[in-house]
C-alpha cells in the first residue's frame, strides 16, 4: 500500500525530518508549513492548526521560504551617486550599484553601501591602474620623457614628441614644443584613455564579515572602528 501523505501540521517519525518547505516547530513539536517568498509567519502553527502566512508590508521583503515573524526591511533608498539595479519588492531587497565614474568603496552582501568618485590624476600624473567597480584609480608621476596635461581618471602618461629642433623642452605636465620642422612621435597624439569600468550588476556575493571591520576588506591591519549602521527607510 502507498504511504499516506501527511498534511501539515504532523508529527515527524522519530529521528525523521520535515519535508521541503516545512520546518519543525519546537513548541508544537510538529512539522509545519513555511511561508513562501514575499510572505512571513503571522501566526505560528499549533498541534492542530498550520502556520498562517501574511504578505510582507511595503518596503519589506522575504526572499526565501521562511517562518520569520516579520519581513526584513529593504535597505535605504539609493543615494544620488548610485543606480538602483534591483527594486525593493516583497520578494527581494533593493540593490544599489555605483554610477559610471564612481566605484564601490564599501561593499555589502549585495550591491554597494558607499560609492566614491574615481580619482582624477592631475597634470604631471597619469593613471597607473584604472578604476573598476570596486577599486579606485591609482595615479603615478609621469616619468622623464613622458607627460600628462589633463586632469583625468583615464589618461596615462604619454611620450613627449621628438623634435628635430626643440623650441620648449617638455616636462611632466607639458609636451615638448618643436620648431616649425615636423616632429616625430612614438605614439599617436592626443590623450590616451584607459577603458572605463563597465557598471554591471553587483558581484558582491560574499557573506558579510564581522561588524568590527568594513565589509569587503581583505588586507591585514589592526581592526578599527566599524562603519556606521545602515539606515532603512520606507518608500
Amino acid at each position: 500500500l502507498p504511504a499516506q501523505v501527511a498534511f501539515t501540521p504532523y508529527a515527524p517519525e522519530p529521528g525523521g525530518t520535515c519535508r521541503l518547505r516545512e520546518y519543525y516547530d519546537q513548541t508544537a513539536q510538529m512539522c509545519c508549513s513555511k511561508c513562501p517568498p514575499g510572505q512571513h509567519a503571522k501566526v505560528f502553527c499549533t498541534k492542530t492548526s498550520d502556520t498562517v502566512c501574511d504578505s510582507c508590508e511595503d518596503s519589506t521583503y522575504t526572499q526565501l521560504w521562511n517562518w520569520v515573524p516579520e519581513c526584513l526591511s529593504c535597505g535605504s533608498r539609493c543615494s544620488s551617486d548610485q543606480v538602483e539595479t534591483q527594486a525593493c519588492t516583497r520578494e527581494q531587497n533593493r540593490i544599489c550599484t555605483c554610477r559610471p565614474g564612481w566605484y564601490c568603496a564599501l561593499t555589502k552582501q549585495e550591491g554597494c553601501r558607499l560609492c566614491a568618485p574615481l580619482r582624477k590624476c592631475r597634470p604631471g600624473f597619469g593613471v597607473a591602474r584604472p578604476g573598476t567597480e570596486t577599486s579606485d584609480v591609482v595615479c603615478k608621476p609621469c616619468a622623464p620623457g613622458t607627460f600628462s596635461n589633463t586632469t583625468s581618471s583615464t589618461d596615462i602618461c604619454r611620450p613627449h614628441q621628438i623634435c628635430n629642433v626643440v623650441a620648449v623642452p617638455g616636462n611632466a605636465s607639458m609636451d615638448a614644443v618643436c620648431t616649425s620642422t615636423s616632429p616625430t612621435r612614438s605614439m599617436a597624439p592626443g590623450p590616451v584613455h584607459l577603458p572605463q569600468p563597465v557598471s554591471t550588476r553587483s558581484q558582491h556575493t560574499q557573506p558579510t564579515p564581522a561588524p568590527s571591520t568594513a565589509p569587503g576588506t581583505s588586507f591585514l591591519l589592526p581592526v578599527g572602528p566599524s562603519p556606521p549602521a545602515e539606515g532603512s527607510t520606507g518608500d
Epitope: A105, L106, T107, S135, T213, A214, G216, L221, P225
Partner: nanobody, 118 residues
C-alpha cells in the same frame, strides 16, 4: 589601537560655517586616503570629500565650492571647512580612512552631528 575622533559639529543657521576636525591615531596617517562621509537621518551613506597622499582633493557635486578638505600630517588631523551651509547638509559626519592600494574604507570615526536650520 586605531582611533578616529571627530569634533566640531553643532547647530548653525543656513548660510553659516562650521569646521570639522578628525584626530587620527594608531596608524600611519600618510599611508591612507582620508575622506568625509555623511549620513542624513533615514538615508544611506553619502561620500562628501577625499584628500589623497599628494594633497590633491575631490568633492561631491553637492558640496563643491562650499566645503574644503585639508589635513595636517604632523598633527595626524583631517579637517572639513564647511561654508554656506544649507539645511540639506544636516547629517552625521564621519571621517574614514582608506589604505592606499586597498580601495575599501577600513577605519571609521564615531561621527559628529551637524544640524543646519533655515
Amino acid at each position: 589601537h586605531v582611533q578616529l575622533v571627530e569634533s566640531g559639529g553643532g547647530s548653525v543657521q543656513a548660510g553659516g560655517s562650521l569646521r570639522l576636525s578628525c584626530a587620527a591615531s594608531g596608524f600611519t596617517f600618510s599611508s591612507y586616503y582620508m575622506s568625509w562621509v555623511r549620513q542624513a537621518p533615514g538615508k544611506g551613506l553619502e561620500w562628501v570629500s577625499a584628500i589623497y597622499s599628494d594633497d590633491s582633493d575631490n568633492y561631491s557635486d553637492s558640496v563643491k565650492g562650499r566645503f574644503t578638505i585639508s589635513k595636517d600630517n604632523a598633527k595626524n588631523t583631517l579637517y572639513l571647512q564647511m561654508n554656506s551651509l544649507k539645511p540639506e547638509d544636516t547629517a552625521m559626519y564621519y571621517c574614514a580612512a582608506i589604505r592606499i592600494g586597498t580601495d575599501q574604507y577600513k577605519f571609521w570615526g564615531q561621527g559628529t552631528q551637524v544640524t543646519v536650520s533655515s
